[in-house]
Interface confidence: low
């Protein structure tokens, strides 16, 4: 016997009760795949979430979190406060990165200002809570008869611990 | 069943002052994080407030700050929001929720149960 429910297209399901017609998904509801033979439910974007886009009858709604908060997890399925530059989120709440670390972002942890050193360079502009140090030139480089100063080292990727 | 039950609404002239309270059943209270949410007549849902399970975290929306307080009693399984120097534009139907899974930490997993909600006017 032949399953006509593969025929049912997104946005049906297929209804057993009434001889494997396709019907419309419900009201909030939606099949975002053909041959379902139910309509999930749709989420709701409500508390500390906010909706991102509409739900349809072909595609489940997408939250964002609030104002002062950011997602977190697959399909922003937590919501995590955020902290200002020069800060982190610990258990206690917003903390000011401790010396010798930064952070540019609303989110996430204080990293340790780069060691110029260690590539031989010298700290061209010192690191403060919110900004990493930018690193110069090294000494040789500044030696009589040497060639022009190099410039700063660019900047590391937001996220990018040093290495 | 869970179920959760708004009380404390009324009608109260600006500058004053009113506690709202939610009776929680059906869950183990002290595990969730709750959160208050509210309704002005022809707007969307606003999130107001939420409260870790242990009480120790406490997350207020920038146009409550200052203004709201929120807290529970596991003991007696109940929610509150102290609100105080009220404003015309706090008139709404205030909703208290559940957080859909339990957690130690500070994050707020989607709401999953809302209450029936209480009616807040703030006129003069």
């Known amino acids: 016997l032949q399953d006509l429910c593969s025929n049912c297209p997104a946005g049906t399901f297929c209804d057993n009760n009434r001889s494997q017609i396709c019907s419309p998904c419900p009201p909030n509801s939606f099949s975002s795949a053909g041959g379902q033979r139910t309509c999930d439910i749709c989420r709701q974007c409500k508390g500390v979430f906010k909706t991102r886009k509409e739900c349809s009858s072909t595609s489940n709604a997408e939250c964002d979190c609030i104002s002062g908060y950011h997602c977190l997890g697959a399909e922003c399925s937590m919501c995590e406060q955020d902290c200002k530059q020069g800060q982190e989120l610990t258990k206690k709440g917003c903390k000011d990165c401790c010396f010798g670390t930064f952070n540019d972002q609303k989110r996430g942890i204080c990293r340790p200002w780069t060691n110029c050193s260690l590539d031989g360079k010298s700290v061209l502009v010192n690191g403060t809570k919110e900004r990493d140090v930018v690193c110069g030139p090294s000494p040789a480089d500044l030696s009589p008869g040497a060639s022009s100063a190099t410039p700063p080292a660019p900047a590391r990727e937001p996220g990018h611990s040093p290495q | 069943e869970v179920q959760l039950l708004e009380s404390g609404g009324g009608l109260v002239q600006p500058g004053g002052s009113l506690r709202l309270s939610c009776a929680a059943s059906g869950f183990t209270f002290s595990s969730y994080a709750m959160s208050w949410g509210r309704q002005a007549p022809g707007k969307g849902l606003e999130w107001v407030s939420a409260?870790?399970?242990?009480?120790?975290?406490?997350y207020y929306a920038d146009s409550v700050k200052g203004r709201f307080t929120i807290s529970r009693d596991n003991s007696k399984n109940t929610l509150y929001l102290h609100m105080n120097s009220l404003r015309a534009e706090d008139t709404a139907v205030y909703y208290c929720?559940?957080?859909?899974?339990?957690?130690?930490?500070?994050?707020?997993?989607?709401?999953?149960?809302w209450g029936q909600g209480t009616t807040v006017t703030v006129s003069s």
């Open positions: 929720a559940k957080e859909k899974v339990a957690t130690t930490g500070d994050y707020y997993y989607d709401m999953d149960v």
């Open positions: 409260i870790s399970g242990s009480g120790g975290s406490t």
